[in-house]
Interface confidence: medium
């Protein structure tokens, strides 16, 4: 049943074999050196590959995986809060590290930045107030969050605030603009003819990453930027407010960062680590900081600002929320109350500060130079019990599995590393300095990366994110997994998972998404193109079409909303666990790389046809600036046949020649890496994958042939066509290079 | 939990004046929209005033125009009905009631108190 994917009865020898195996060999003189060297690796990985503990396979490591230890472990990590560049967030830096240690890994370390950070000011906080015509202040948004019982007596809870905006008191008229998105900016400045230059507008939380909201608002002229929770997005009819369900409160606020650094890490560092002797840009040249003030708040406040609003009606039910207020789009207030303002408050500070990152080992018997890297952060913005902690917790019980067959001999093949990442809230800041520390080992030896945060965002089905090569991965892996979920008894995850989740394009198969960004995977998938995948429960997106989960990022995601209403038994985040880890095991431990090339083959074709399709709205155009998409197609269908033969000397070498079987297992490694462009893409230089990168209109998801795509979008607006044509053919040109060269990549060496 | 209790009903003659209370506790008192509702015997029911969350917008049924005055006071989480020339036809069970703030959400209701203006 264990027996997945190629040859993964894949347990190696309990220990390393006895260096005298291969001394004899030494014995021959100068010219038989080379030969002698080959004839030891030879004997040594044969015999090790070929002494295989049963105890020790994967059903080993998965039985060993308890929903119990990890309530504990989500329990312990929550208790407090652990905000990046704070003491308690050290301490369970240092905490981890003990016990990893103790789980049994072959080294911990704790990996130091100095990075920028961003909190508001103690004594000089941070709100928003309407004001009357004589400029006092008639109205002022709450301070901080009522606490959720049991939390009222806990210290350094956050208030909440937009990370890293710069300091200022604005003031002006209002404007609604629904989510900030670039559709929405374009429906009020094109079709309505609304003007948010020197405006303060207001856009409800959802859709997209809330950096691109900042950024579309700047690109529109405002001059201040309120975010809040609409109930339409984060509260799900029919359920209470925490603490009596998983709805968010009137006084609830989603904290976060509104940068848009598009994968540079720490604002001052961008491109390298930012270490002891790190050269540090001046905070007006940092790397996507935004310009004008923001804050975040509740829907109780938020209902005391939408409701005076006048000027425009909304224009169409898609700019409706759920709030009983008219949802006028302004700009200012209506009739009675059209002379008073809006005035921000906001004297939040940037600080370069401290941060860790904790790096486990466990060493791999055959190949110690393949890196197959578990990584999730550690640091929240209050008390973390689903972001991060959920992960974390899920992390940290696959490290004790690890280590227990580690204590009892076992290696994995490959070396894998755990990393609990720090800053991530702050925008990827902990992965993304030790990728850039790390950069020349990792595009060297990086095989593959999970990423670990939240392990839940609903109880509903798996949700799945990951470059092709792991797709047959995760369904070979499904199928041998139970399925959690009720009315699945004995059935498979991957069957509760299809059903509940069917593919959009294959029948009988689940569905798959793209990579985006806006976790810790980006600076591994879209910058170094080390293969990478995410996995966690998620909601049931049919009938919950709110963003996110409603408490994300507010002081009420606690251990009580995970053991109350989300996962009681635990079961979801043990079939997480089993997900991630099966995952790293298979990564780690199979003989051949469970990267199966054709299914890169068949996406590729698909978002060849998706980009021509959009190009092929525009037909006079493509006529009059001779623009081709054949040598894309050309090259697809090479990367078709190639791997298709590929895959077929796959499947017929000899496994027992280790030199053939590295070079095989190196043509799949390296295959994501062929897809990185060293120069990167247009004004994004560290989105460096040609197939995938985060959507320039939102961070979060994910945008196949990106440069193709940024170079058609809202084509017809653009003042000069033959340029932006000429940029089409040129963005056409490099993916298809990319793909041939890709392709080139899998054929037979010699 | 929501809670909303009225008090400050009773029996009083045509002419005179009657001072409901609400005590509201459960919810962020100063968030909402308050109102005023009544229910004459064997009739249906009747909105009679509300209120904005600050209090600086006020509304009333016609038949009450002039005679009744809502108030509140955030800071102790109450709501208020002042009846002044009071008629037989306002004899009523009065009730305090919470709007919701989101669309489809219920409101929530007190259990009332029972104004009689008889002589």
């Known amino acids: 049943m264990w027996n997945l994917l190629h040859e993964t009865d894949s347990a190696v020898a309990t220990a390393r074999r006895p260096r005298w195996l291969c001394a004899g060999a030494l014995v021959l003189a100068g010219g038989f050196f080379l030969l002698g060297f080959l004839f030891g690796w030879f004997i040594k990985s044969s015999n090790e590959a070929t002494n295989i503990t049963p105890k020790h396979n994967m059903k080993a490591f998965l039985d060993e995986l308890k929903a119990e230890n990890i309530k504990k472990f989500l329990y312990n990590f929550t208790q407090i809060p652990h905000l990046a560049g704070t003491e308690q967030n050290f301490q369970l830096a240092k905490q981890i590290q003990s016990q990893w240690k103790e789980f049994g890994l072959d080294s911990v370390e704790l990996a130091h930045y100095d990075v920028l950070l961003s909190y508001p000011n103690k004594t000089h906080p941070n709100y928003i107030s309407i004001i009357n015509e004589d400029g006092n202040e008639i109205f002022n948004t709450s301070l901080f969050e009522p606490p959720p019982p049991g939390y009222e007596n806990v210290s350094d809870i956050v208030p909440p605030f937009s990370a890293f905006s710069p300091q200022g008191m604005p003031e002006g008229d209002l404007v609604y603009v629904n989510y900030a998105r670039t559709e929405d900016f374009f429906k009020l400045e094109r079709d309505m003819k609304i003007n948010c230059s020197g405006k303060i507008v207001i856009a409800r939380y959802g859709k997209v990453f809330r950096g691109n909201k900042v950024k579309n608002a700047q690109l529109a002229g405002a001059k201040g930027v309120i975010l809040y929770s609409d109930p339409a997005d984060y509260f799900a009819p029919g359920v209470k407010s925490y603490p009596d369900g998983w709805n968010l409160p009137g006084g609830g606020v989603q904290r976060g960062n509104i940068l848009n650094l598009n994968g540079a890490g720490d604002p001052l560092t961008p491109g390298y680590p930012a270490n002891e002797y790190a050269y540090r840009r001046g905070i007006a040249e940092a790397v996507g900081l935004p310009s004008i003030p923001v804050h975040p708040i509740g829907y109780y406040d938020a209902q005391k600002l939408l409701e005076k609003m006048g000027g425009s009606a909304p224009p169409d039910s898609s700019w409706r929320g759920s709030l009983k207020v008219p949802y006028n789009v302004g700009p200012g207030f209506t009739g009675n109350f059209s002379t008073q303002k809006v005035k921000m408050h906001i004297h939040s500070t940037n600080e370069v500060t401290r941060i860790y990152n904790v790096i486990g080992t466990l060493r791999g018997a055959v190949e110690p130079d393949r890196y197959v890297i578990l990584g999730g952060h550690r640091d929240s913005w209050v008390f973390g019990g689903i972001d991060p902690q959920s992960g974390a917790a899920v992390v940290h019980e696959i490290v004790r599995s690890f280590g227990t067959l580690k204590k009892e001999g076992w290696r994995p093949r490959r070396t894998i590393l755990f990393a609990s990442w720090d800053a991530e809230e702050f925008g990827l800041l902990g992965s993304t300095e030790w990728a850039e520390e790390n950069s020349r080992l990792l595009q060297e030896r990086g095989v593959a990366y999970i990423n670990a945060d939240s392990s839940i965002e609903g109880n509903y089905t798996l949700r799945v994110d990951c470059t092709p090569l792991m797709y047959s991965l995760v369904h070979n892996l499904t199928k041998e997994l139970k399925s959690p979920d009720e009315g699945f008894e004995g059935k498979s995850l991957y069957e509760s998972w299809t059903k509940k989740s069917p593919s959009p394009e294959f029948s009988g198969m689940p569905r798959i998404s793209k990579l985006g960004s806006g976790n810790d995977f980006e600076v591994f998938f879209q910058r170094l193109g080390i293969a990478s995948g995410r996995a966690r429960y998620t909601k049931n997106w049919e009938t919950n079409k709110f963003s996110g989960y409603p408490l994300y990022h507010s002081v009420y995601e606690t251990y009580e909303l995970v053991e109350k209403f989300y996962d009681p038994m635990f079961k979801y985040h043990l079939t997480v666990a089993q997900v991630r880890g099966g995952m790293v095991f298979e990564l780690a431990n199979s003989i051949v790389l469970p990267f199966d090339c054709r299914d890169y083959a068949v996406v590729l074709r698909k978002y060849a046809d998706k980009i021509y399709s959009i190009s092929m709205k525009h037909p006079q155009e493509m006529k009059t600036y001779s623009v081709s998409f054949d040598s894309l197609f050309s090259a697809v269908k090479n990367f078709t046949e190639i791997a298709s033969k590929f895959s077929e000397r796959l499947q017929d070498f000899d496994k027992s020649n280790p030199i053939v079987l590295r070079m095989m297992n190196d043509q799949l490694m390296f295959l994501e890496r062929a897809f990185i462009d060293p120069l990167g893409l247009p004004d994004r230089p560290f989105y460096r994958h040609v197939i995938y990168a985060p959507s320039s209109h939102n961070k979060y998801a994910g945008e196949s042939f990106p440069g193709i795509y940024d170079a058609l979008f809202d084509i017809e607006s653009k003042v000069d066509p033959s340029k932006a044509w000429g940029e089409v053919k040129r963005q056409i040109y490099v993916a298809a290079f990319t793909v041939q060269a890709a392709a080139e990549t899998l054929s037979e060496v010699a | 939990e929501v809670q909303l209790v009225e008090s400050g009903g009773g029996l009083v003659q045509p002419g005179g004046s009657l001072r409901l209370s609400c005590a509201a506790s459960g919810f962020t008192f100063s968030s909402y929209w308050m109102y005023w509702v009544r229910q004459a015997p064997g009739k249906g029911l009747e909105w009679v005033a509300n209120?904005?969350?600050?209090?600086?917008?006020?509304y009333y049924v016609d038949s009450v125009k002039g005679r009744f005055t809502i108030s509140r006071d955030n800071a102790k989480n109450s709501l208020y009905l002042q009846m002044n020339s009071l008629r037989a036809e306002d004899t009523a069970v009065y009730y305090c009631a919470r709007d919701s703030l989101i669309v489809g959400e219920r409101g929530y209701w007190g259990q009332g108190t029972l104004v009689t203006v008889s002589s």
């Open positions: 209120i904005n969350h600050g209090g600086s917008e006020k």
